[in-house]
Amino acid sequence: APVLPGEDSKDVAAPHSQPLTSSERIDKHIRYILDGISALRKETCNRSNMCESSKEALAENNLNLPKMAEKDGCFQSGFNEDTCLVKIITGLLEFEVYLEYLQNRFESSEEQARAVQMSTKVLIQFLQKKAKNLDAITTPEPTTNASLLTKLQAQNQWLQDMTTHLILRSFKEFLQSSLRALRQM
């Protein structure tokens, strides 16, 4: 796993070496992943004109990317710590297949894509330690993920560029909402 800036390598490599409920470690971890996403978005935007595409045009896709909704209890109005934490973990687990898809989509930022993927896995571990209502967390079926990955990789170049852009944008928005919510936990 990549070492986060300002963290000891043992903190990340051996996640049980310190209490995992530390808000600060989760906060720093998410911000590290967001920095990685920014770098990946930069390469994507330099490579294609997807970043100029209107939100409306991009919305017309059949990707089922995780998104925060009012019912998830992660927004300031109607905030619910338990419900929100479950949503964040479930959402991150759902994003994993999309992060796997990103692995072969970058040239100069190949290591950055790997770091985002591995850091997300560590973040999920942190959050699962924090959650008491683990029964409510649904893990995506491996077979479903495998067929989705195959389908995404079979798209033409233009669709692959659009998919990459949408994943990064959605993951960024999901993490930003998560970050704000986790700061009240």
Partner: antibody, heavy 120, light 111 residues
């Protein structure tokens, strides 16, 4: 208008107990993490304890760990601090404080405080 | 309790600029953008001025600004006014402690 009103302070002997309460109004209490911060006479501020918005996670300063318990009742919009085995060095004004939404470790609203005096 | 180091007092005349420093370590002030500043007027509860090192809290005049260099944070008050006379506290996250405050600085606005 956000209001935090502390109560329950008073004079107590060393080894005694007190329970502080903080009645919150003017905001959605259940959406915010809360803390207690204290200030000894003529001294600076000291963070005492924090509780997450839903009451799932609690955190304590080493100086009070094992003696103080923070809790909350979101249905009553009230924050509590149960203080046991009190020591003279716990004498202070205790403030109930709210964490700013989406901001790490910054208190955007403070109550007026309640005085706790531990003396024989 | 261990605290961040602030000068006990600073002073300035109306209209002047004063800076209050807050020295910590790589474990607190230097660790992230987690520094905040509070103003405590005599007999009152503290009030948030600055959070995340340099962001002004709602309703705070732009005369108040925050910055950080290494393990030291600073609060700068420009165009000093008589009502700025108060105690000022810095605060930061410190690993395992959650929040650590400075010892406080009393600002005197001269005659």
């Amino acid at each position: 208008e956000v209001q935090l009103v502390e109560s329950g302070g008073g004079l107590v002997q060393p080894g005694g107990s007190l329970r502080l309460s903080c009645a919150a109004s003017g905001f959605t209490f259940s959406s915010y993490a809360m803390s207690w911060v204290r200030q000894a006479p003529g001294k600076g501020l000291e963070w005492v304890s924090r509780i997450s918005s839903g009451g799932i996670s609690t955190y304590y300063a080493d100086s009070v760990k094992g003696r103080f318990t923070i809790s909350r009742d979101n249905a009553k919009n009230t924050l509590y601090l149960q203080m046991n085995s009190l020591k003279p060095e716990d004498t202070a004004v205790y403030y109930c404080v709210r964490y700013a939404w989406g901001v790490q470790w910054a208190f955007d609203f403070w109550g007026q405080g309640t005085q706790v005096t531990v003396s024989s | 309790q261990s605290v961040l180091t602030q000068p006990p007092s600073v002073s300035g005349s109306p209209g002047q600029t004063v800076t209050i420093s807050c020295a910590g370590t790589s474990e607190d002030v230097g660790y992230g953008n987690y520094v905040s500043w509070y103003q405590q007027l005599p007999g009152m509860a503290p009030k948030l001025l600055i959070y995340d090192v340099n962001k002004r809290a709602s309703g705070i005049a732009d005369r108040f600004s925050g910055s950080k260099s290494g393990n030291t944070a600073s609060l700068t008050i420009s165009g000093l006014q008589s009502e700025d006379e108060a105690d000022y506290y810095c605060a930061s996250y410190r690993r395992t402690i959650d929040n650590i405050f400075g010892g406080g600085t009393h600002l005197t606005v001269l005659g």
